[in-house]
Every structure is written in structure tokens, then in C-alpha cells.
Amino acid sequence: RLSWYDPDFQARLTRSNSKCQGQLEVYLKDGWHMVCSQSWGRSSKQWEDPSQASKVCQRLNCGVPLSLGPFLVTYTPQSSIICYGQLGSFSNCSHSRNDMCHSLGLTCLEPQKTTPPTTRPPPTTTPEPTAPPRLQLVAQSGGQHCAGVVEFYSGSLGGTISYEAQDKTQDLENFLCNNLQCGSFLKHLPETEAGRAQDPGEPREHQPLPIQWKIQNSSCTSLEHCFRKIKPQKSGRVLALLCSGFQPKVQSRLVGGSSICEGTVEVRQGAQWAALCDSSSARSSLRWEEVCREQQCGSVNSYRVLDAGDPTSRGLFCPHQKLSQCHELWERNSYCKKVFVTCQDPNP
């Protein structure tokens, strides 16, 4: 009985610029097939607990699964299948009409170059001077990878870092993001976004740590020289960062064009797709190159900002030049100017 738990099961994720997210395709005896999200009695709008697909992510050498559900932008290959029985079982599948199939999408965490420890060191009174100092980013539950409250551990001591908004620390933030293998620093997160607010029912290991640190040298080049221990503060901000390696990234698609390589740009917020509104401050091919690449098309040829004559036209807005820098999309409820992008067709 073939299922995605079997050791010889073969899968791939397509239609994105990462091997760790995209449309799920599986290899059965007669070739590769796209899996419809209506499989296993699900509806094409239903989202699953992604942890059920952890074996697939593992097999693709990716990190933990972040989302499992309708991919929403369906590119139908030669063959699509609907499967029956238990979730993840492929022993009873039938071919589906392409126009009836909504593809199943899976997003796994991109693999880290080296795996930092995933658990906090337990509070202990025994000094461990040999343990090298290290950092950890603590995200909200369901939050993003490479985004969250920074915790610093030195030996057995660990805790958050006190941060004042006036601190001039850009070099330090870049150093920290880099040390965490999360790219470069993008911005500070408000604590609500970073997940500092504590749920009273949360398990003990996620309660605030007893130690706090203060930035000692914002130009430090090794962790042991960056911070000094202070008495924990009841109030005040803690350092919370968003780094460029955050995941998952905004997904995009082109709709309403004559091919998959042209159309009005839409982006995904949760399970919903909506128009991406023009941003005059980010009006450059830098943004559209990323979109073209995500559609697996060639370089951007042209783009047209469509007039928003209708005051009720709505959509989503990203203030950054590159969509990959957008960790949140803002809703625009009026005068959303859509953008029609034409990319080079990779197979003219």
C-alpha cells in the first residue's frame, strides 16, 4: 500500500523557485502525476495540519512542513490524480479531468546550512563554560522562520536582549542575522509580532528566561563580546528581528494573460489570492523579475500600471521593492492599481 510514509515513495514540488515549496507531484508506476487537493475526501478549499506531510519534506531534504493545502494557482501537467482512503495514501488513485483538479500545495521550511539546536538549554545552576555562546530566534507559534525575539545563551545562562529604540545597532543586527544563518537584517519587529506576549497556559520551557542581556558592543565580530548580563527588566523592549531569510515568502501568480508568463499580478495572503496593488516607491523591474522567476518564466519584458478608476478596487500592498522582502502584506480597500506584467516565455 503506497503512501508518502513509504521509504521508496517519490515526490517533488514544482511551480515555484524553491524545491521546498510548490505544487505536489508524485511518481507512480507510469510517471509523474499532479495531486489534486480534493484527494482523500477533502474539499479544494480545505487546509490540513501540515505536520502530516513531514515525511515528504524530509525526503526532499527540506525542513519542517509549514502549510499543506490548495496550491490555488494550478498548472496542469499531462496527468493529475485524485486519491482515496487515508490522507497521504496513493494506492487507490484515479485520473482526474484537468479542469476539475485544484492542485495540492506543500510548503516546507528551506533547509538550514547547518542545524542550530532547536530546543532551549534547560535552566541549570551548573556552569558550563565550555558551551560556545549561541543565539536563537523565538517565533510566535505558527510564526515565521528567521523572525522573532532574539535569545542569547552563554554557557548555562540564556535570555532576551534589552533593546532601546535609539540604539544605533545596524551592524549588530546584520551580524546576528548572519550568525543565525538567516541572511541580513531587514527590520525590528514589534514584540506583539515577534511573539513575546506570553500565553499563561504555555508550557514552562516557553516562559520568559531568568537572564537578560544588554548590548555591550554593537560592532562586535564574535558573540561573546556583544552582550553583558543585566538584572531582568520588568518593562522595556527586547530585541526582536526580521531577517532576509524569513520563511514562508509571499507567493505570486499571473492571471488573465494569454499564457502563464503574462497577466495581472496576484499574491497570496493565507489561503486567499488578491491583486497586488502598485506601489510607486517600488515601481521597478526588481519586483517583477522575482515574479517572473516564480512562474518559471524568463526575464521581465514590460509592465503596465492599470488605472484604478474604481474607488472600491481592493488588493494587497507591499511597501518594499522586492516581494521577497515583504513579511506582511497590507490590505488596500480602495483605488488599488493592478499591474499587468509580461515575462519572456521560456519556451517560445
Epitope: R283, S284, V300, N301, Y303, R304, V305, D307, K337
Partner: nanobody
């Protein structure tokens, strides 16, 4: 159509410097943004650095931050990329691109033919 011509590529040792130039065939008045991209054999084309006008805000790939500097010389219709502390992984064909504003919200994107940069170890 705006023609873009890159120059300044070549062979350099690791740790060395190069200065790439991209010349536009007509006034940069209608050019709203310019960028440098690179493509190594068997890899996707990737952003190196970009600059918008008139604000001149810049954007760099993480891998080149602190080593490369992009700038524009509007008087000469050129864009420059100063590349310092070059590494073997910077080896690629470097392309420049420009966004041309045709009015009424319509922009086309022109690409140069590329210039080869090879960094030996």
C-alpha cells in the same frame, strides 16, 4: 528602444576589484530604475544590485553587501558597479537592465548583452 552596453568585465584574482559600467543609448530621463544581475553557468539569473531614480534608493543581494557599490551618473547616461573583495563565487556573466517609462503607466525593460567576470582563486 534603449540599448544598454556593459563593459569593464575581465579576469581578476580573488580579493581584487573591478568596475563595471553600463551605458544607455539615450537620455536617462525616461529611465526610472537600473540594475545589475548575474548568471553563473547552470544557475538562474540573480539580482546583484539595483538603483531607482530620482531618489537613488539602492538594493543589494545579501552576498554582495559591503563589497559592491552601485551608482548612477545621469550626466553620462551610465550606471556603475564597483566590485571590491571579489570572490571566486562572483564569477558570472553580469547583465545590466533599465526600466523605461513610456508614460501612462507603461514601462518596458531593456537588457544588455552581458559582460563576463571571472575571479580566479
Amino acid at each position: 528602444e534603449v540599448q544598454l552596453v556593459e563593459s569593464g568585465g575581465g579576469l581578476v584574482q580573488a580579493g581584487g576589484s573591478l568596475r563595471l559600467s553600463c551605458a544607455a543609448s539615450e537620455s536617462t530621463f525616461s529611465i526610472t530604475a537600473m540594475g545589475w544581475y548575474r548568471q553563473a553557468p547552470g544557475k538562474q539569473r540573480e539580482l546583484v544590485a539595483a538603483i531607482t531614480s530620482p531618489g537613488g534608493s539602492t538594493n543589494y543581494a545579501d552576498s554582495v553587501k559591503g563589497r559592491f557599490t552601485i551608482s548612477r551618473d545621469n550626466a553620462k547616461n551610465t550606471m556603475l558597479l564597483q566590485m571590491n573583495s571579489l570572490k571566486p563565487e562572483d564569477t558570472a556573466v553580469y547583465y545590466c537592465n533599465a526600466d523605461i517609462n513610456h508614460g501612462s503607466g507603461y514601462y518596458t525593460v531593456s537588457w544588455g548583452q552581458g559582460t563576463q567576470v571571472t575571479v580566479s582563486s
